[in-house]
């Protein structure tokens, strides 16, 4: 299934998507939509680019903050709410080719949890579970095969998140 990315309410979420312009600088249209990629295009479009720039955003919370001109079309959603949870489609609309590149990613927005820290735990979040934590502006994305690691429940995620944050560790955005 699609890779999950986790963000806390009020934080920024980062959903990775990229392609390699060929030749370099030869950009193609891209759309981001809320909901799995449909048969064509994107449904419930939140952001759309043309061959030069972003030309359609449904809200000022949606941004492409990566190097758009090098094919980094990762979506940043600012100040996420629980309503932002769900599957998003990044569709790279390659002209002259019969098939667009379709990428479905899942955003899970969680409420900030207040958990008593256990400072002895020093463990890399990305090896703890097959979901990616997303807390803002970092990047680039780290790729990981979904389902290749044991799953954990949200309580464990809360605990790991807070323990790492409280111990000063950096939580990488994926």
């Amino acid at each position: 299934s699609e890779v999950e990315y986790i963000a806390e309410v009020g934080q920024n979420a980062y959903l990775p998507c990229s392609y390699t312009p060929a030749p370099p600088g030869n950009l193609v249209p891209v759309c981001w939509g809320k909901g799995a990629c449909p048969v064509f295009d994107c449904s419930n479009v939140v952001l759309r680019t043309d061959n030069r720039d972003v030309n359609d955003r449904t809200s000022g919370r949606y941004w492409l903050k990566g190097d758009f001109h090098k094919g980094d079309v990762s979506l940043t959603i600012e100040n996420v709410t629980l309503a932002d949870s769900g599957v998003y489609c990044c569709r790279i609309q390659i002209p002259g080719i019969m098939n667009d590149e379709k990428h479905n990613v899942k955003l899970v927005v969680i409420k900030p949890a207040k958990v008593t820290p256990a400072p002895t735990l020093q463990r890399d979040l990305t090896s703890a579970f097959p979901r990616m934590l997303t807390t803002g502006e970092h990047g680039p994305a780290e790729t990981q095969t979904p389902g290749s690691l044991p799953d954990v429940n949200l309580t464990q995620i809360f605990t790991l998140t807070n323990e790492l944050r409280d111990s000063g560790a950096t939580i990488r955005t994926a």
């Epitope: 699609e2 990629c37 449909p38 048969v39 064509f40 295009d41 449904s43 019969m98 098939n99 379709k102």
Partner: antibody, heavy 114, light 107 residues
Framework: EVQLQESGPSLVKPSQTLSLTCSVT????????WNWIRKFPGNKLEYMGY???????YYNPSLKSRISITRDTSQNQYYLQLNSVTTEDTATYYC????????WGRGTTLTVSS | DIQMTQSPSSLSAYLGGKVTITCKAR??????IGWYQHKPGKGPRLLIW???TLQSGIPSRFSGSGSGRDYSFNINNLEPEDIATYYC?????????FGTGTKLEIR
């Protein structure tokens, strides 16, 4: 809600050209993608192709040399033309649209026979 | 083209019972699968998209699952109006291709 209605002849002779019309209400054919799909007597469904909001087309390679999909935005209609038909083209033809092929016409049944 | 192998081609089940239909794609279609119900004289009706998402207005008796090359479709608590032919569709790659269909009858 989008509604589609197919129209055209019910009988065509082999080697002739088939022309079908899809009349669309509830949406403009200057947006989205507009498809043709057919169902053969043995129940097999085949995707034939589309015309989209900009007038770009895609045709199933199995039909490429014989098929043409066009549109008339002023009439809000799009069309299927299939050349050099044979008895193998006997089928029910559907016009279809929607994010996941949500909207289908009722279909028009075509028999190719001499 | 991506061939979709659907089975069984027909099945018969009791009212209130459960049926399962499967589709196997020749290659990974990344969950880009829809399921349709077709009754004579009508256009096919979308039931499920993206493998498991129920289309608006479709009863929760219908469900789908799968990933990679293997997909399945279930109807629980069969009702008389479920008599129809059911198809899977892969929309991952053009040309989009349908399964061969499963004709459902009620005993």
């Amino acid at each position: 809600e989008v509604q589609l209605q197919e129209s055209g002849p019910s009988l065509v002779k082999p080697s002739q050209t088939l022309s079908l019309t899809c009349s669309v209400t509830g949406d403009s054919i200057a947006s989205a993608y507009w498809n043709w799909i057919r169902k053969f007597p043995g129940n097999k469904l085949e995707y034939m192709g589309y015309i989209n909001y900009s007038g770009s087309t895609y045709y199933n390679p199995s039909l490429k040399s014989r098929i043409s999909i066009t549109r008339d935005t002023s009439q809000n209609q799009y069309y299927l033309q299939l050349n050099s038909v044979t008895t193998e083209d006997t089928a029910t033809y559907y016009c279809v649209t929607g994010d996941y092929f949500d909207y289908w016409g009722r279909g028009t049944t075509l028999t190719v026979s001499s | 083209d991506i061939q979709m192998t659907q089975s069984p081609s027909s099945l018969s089940a009791y009212l209130g019972g459960k049926v399962t239909i499967t589709c196997k794609a020749r290659q990974d279609v990344r969950k880009n699968i829809g399921w349709y119900q077709h009754k004579p004289g009508k256009g096919p009706r979308l039931l499920i998209w993206y493998t498991s998402t129920l289309q608006s207005g479709i009863p929760s008796r219908f469900s789908g699952s799968g990933s990679g090359r293997d997909y399945s479709f279930n109807i629980n608590n069969l009702e008389p109006e479920d008599i129809a032919t059911y198809y899977c569709l892969q929309y991952d790659n053009l040309p989009f291709t349908f399964g061969t269909g499963t004709k459902l009858e009620i005993r």
